[in-house]
Interface confidence: low
């Protein structure tokens, strides 16, 4: 509308007693420049005088007066298109409408601004993403709509009332759009903050304490498990039973399946926190964890290694090697299955026992042609002795001995 | 906000049973876990059960459990407490509570956003 002038400034200012209030504006006047300004406070027009009523903050006209009282209140615009406004300090009774009497050559107008002045510093606000996951990098942010040049101010981050060691990014705006203080922190909660209180303060330059914000984390995570065992050592015989207990330590949102694993794989069937396993057998050794998802996802706990112990089964003979040519050196291994592993082997040939042989190895350096037979050994350990297995047989390759003409 | 008002105390003989309410109103719909507590003189506000927002899971102290119940009635947005057998050491004031942060919290009572105003149970023996 070519018949107003054109004014560009933030609809509504906030300050606190004692503070200061800087008033961005911009405008452009009908015709010339501009020859008389006055600020008021709540004007009202009074149709008798045809003139604003109301308190004078501040009065410029081609004279150049200023009342010298309001040396507070000062006008940093021009006389064509900078309206800004500096109160500095700003009180309680500042609150409510300004009016801009602006009067060019020609013409008048009369730009109205909404002022609010609390009585204490009013709490900056904290803005969270809507959700917030472990591990994820989130951006918490912090504002406060106010900012002025007179009064630095400063916004700290604080976790349980411990400042954050994280670097925040802090930014202001004194624009004809908007006027505002920033915080922005870059965080990646883990589950334990879940839960937390994160509040961001408000300070003077000195670091004194003017107001703060604050929230609790809702921090979405996997379950968080500790598994338990009797015996707690996890170390059984053939025969015992084991009990294995699975305990969430924390879930959110709430937990929906529980499964047990052993070595990677699901058991069947197993879908309580308590895994009872009754009179073990060897095969049942092995790693076990227990799972339990919720909505972020699977949660697993510690693996449990369960040893199941046992008498060594029956063993077999393995010979390096045979058929051996007399005067080579021949190895013989005795290998059982068994846990914990064999502490004492006898071993026997062509079933007598062999004295002195106690190792899991048997060593001949120089292999004669009497050693040739049935070797076979006995594994031994601390839950009893294996039985002997059917043996191996060492071949001896020899020259012809005592040769006689027929 | 939330408000919660209990009801349901009052004098019972040892062995006797009551059942305590919690109706909560407000912005109940923002409810996750909901609490009791109770404060005998002199002593701290101690955890007694909880359930969880679904209705799925329920927690009880060790003191209680076995004789004491959660249950709700999601169309009065009420909580009760089923208390049975009850002992001179159950004497206390009982508050019921809410948090929105997660069933880890559920003993926790730093954590819990609202509170009652209390009911008297005394236990005489």
């Known amino acids: 509308d070519s018949s107003k002038w054109v004014f560009e400034h933030p609809e509504t200012l906030y300050a606190w007693e004692g503070a200061c209030v800087w008033i961005p504006c911009t405008y452009r006047a009908l015709d010339g420049d501009l020859e008389s300004f006055i600020l008021f406070h709540n004007p009202e027009y009074n149709k008798n005088t045809s003139k604003f009523d109301g308190t004078r903050l501040y009065e410029s006209t081609k004279d150049g007066k200023v009342p010298s009282e309001q040396k507070r209140v000062q006008f940093l615009g021009d006389k064509n298109k900078n309206c800004t406004l500096s109160i500095h300090p700003v009180h309680l009774n500042d609150s409510g409408q300004l009016g801009l009497r602006m009067e060019s050559k020609t013409e008048k107008w009369m730009e109205r601004i909404h002022l609010n002045v609390s009585e204490r510093p009013f709490p900056p606000h904290i803005q969270l993403p809507p959700e917030i996951q472990e591990s994820q990098e989130v951006t918490l942010t912090c504002l406060l709509n106010f900012s002025c040049y007179g009064y630095p101010i400063q916004l700290q981050w604080l976790l349980e009332g411990v400042p954050m060691r994280q670097a925040a990014v802090t930014s202001t705006s004194l624009t004809i759009k908007s006027v505002f203080t920033r915080s922005e922190l870059k965080f990646s909660p883990q589950w334990s903050h879940h839960g937390k209180i994160v509040t961001c303060q408000l300070q003077d330059a000195d670091g004194k304490f003017l107001s703060n914000d604050t929230v609790q984390l809702n921090v979405k995570h996997t379950p968080k498990l500790e598994i338990k065992v009797t015996p707690s050592d996890a170390i059984v015989r053939e025969g015992d039973s084991v009990t294995m207990t699975c305990e969430v330590s924390s879930s959110n949102p709430e937990y929906t399946t529980v499964s047990w694993l052993k070595d990677g794989t699901s058991l069947k069937k197993q879908n309580t926190f308590t895994l009872n396993l009754r009179e073990v057998t060897k095969d049942q050794s092995g790693k076990y964890c227990c799972q339990v998802s919720n909505d972020v996802g699977p949660g697993r706990s510690e693996e449990v290694f369960l040893q199941v112990q046992y008498a060594p089964e029956p063993s077999t003979v393995q010979i390096l090697h045979s058929p051996a040519v007399e005067g080579s050196q021949v190895e013989f291994l005795c290998m059982s299955l068994a846990n914990p592993l064999p502490t004492n082997y006898t071993w026997y040939h062509n079933g007598k026992e062999m004295q002195g042989r106690t190792e899991e190895k048997v060593h001949i350096p120089k292999i004669l042609p009497w050693h040739a037979g049935t070797y076979s050994c006995v594994a031994e350990n601390i839950l009893g002795t294996g039985q002997r297995g059917p043996g191996a047989e060492l071949d001896v390759q020899y020259p012809p001995k005592k040769v006689t003409t027929v | 906000q939330v408000q919660l008002v209990e009801s349901g105390g009052g004098l019972v003989q040892a062995g006797g049973s009551l059942r305590l309410a919690c109706a909560a109103s407000g912005d109940t719909v923002s409810i996750y876990y909901m609490g009791w507590f109770r404060q005998a003189p002199g002593k701290e506000r101690e955890f007694v059960g909880a359930l969880s927002a679904s209705g799925q899971f329920t927690d009880h102290a060790d003191s209680v459990k076995g004789r004491f119940t959660i249950s709700r009635d999601d169309a009065q947005n009420t909580v009760f407490l089923h208390m049975n057998d009850l002992k001179p050491e159950d004497t206390a004031v009982y508050y019921c509570?809410?948090?929105?942060?997660?069933?880890?919290?559920?003993?926790?009572?730093?954590?819990?956003?609202?509170w009652g105003q209390g009911t008297q149970v005394t236990v005489s023996s």
């Open positions: 509570a809410v948090q929105r942060y997660g069933w880890v919290y559920r003993t926790d009572k730093t954590m819990y956003n609202y």
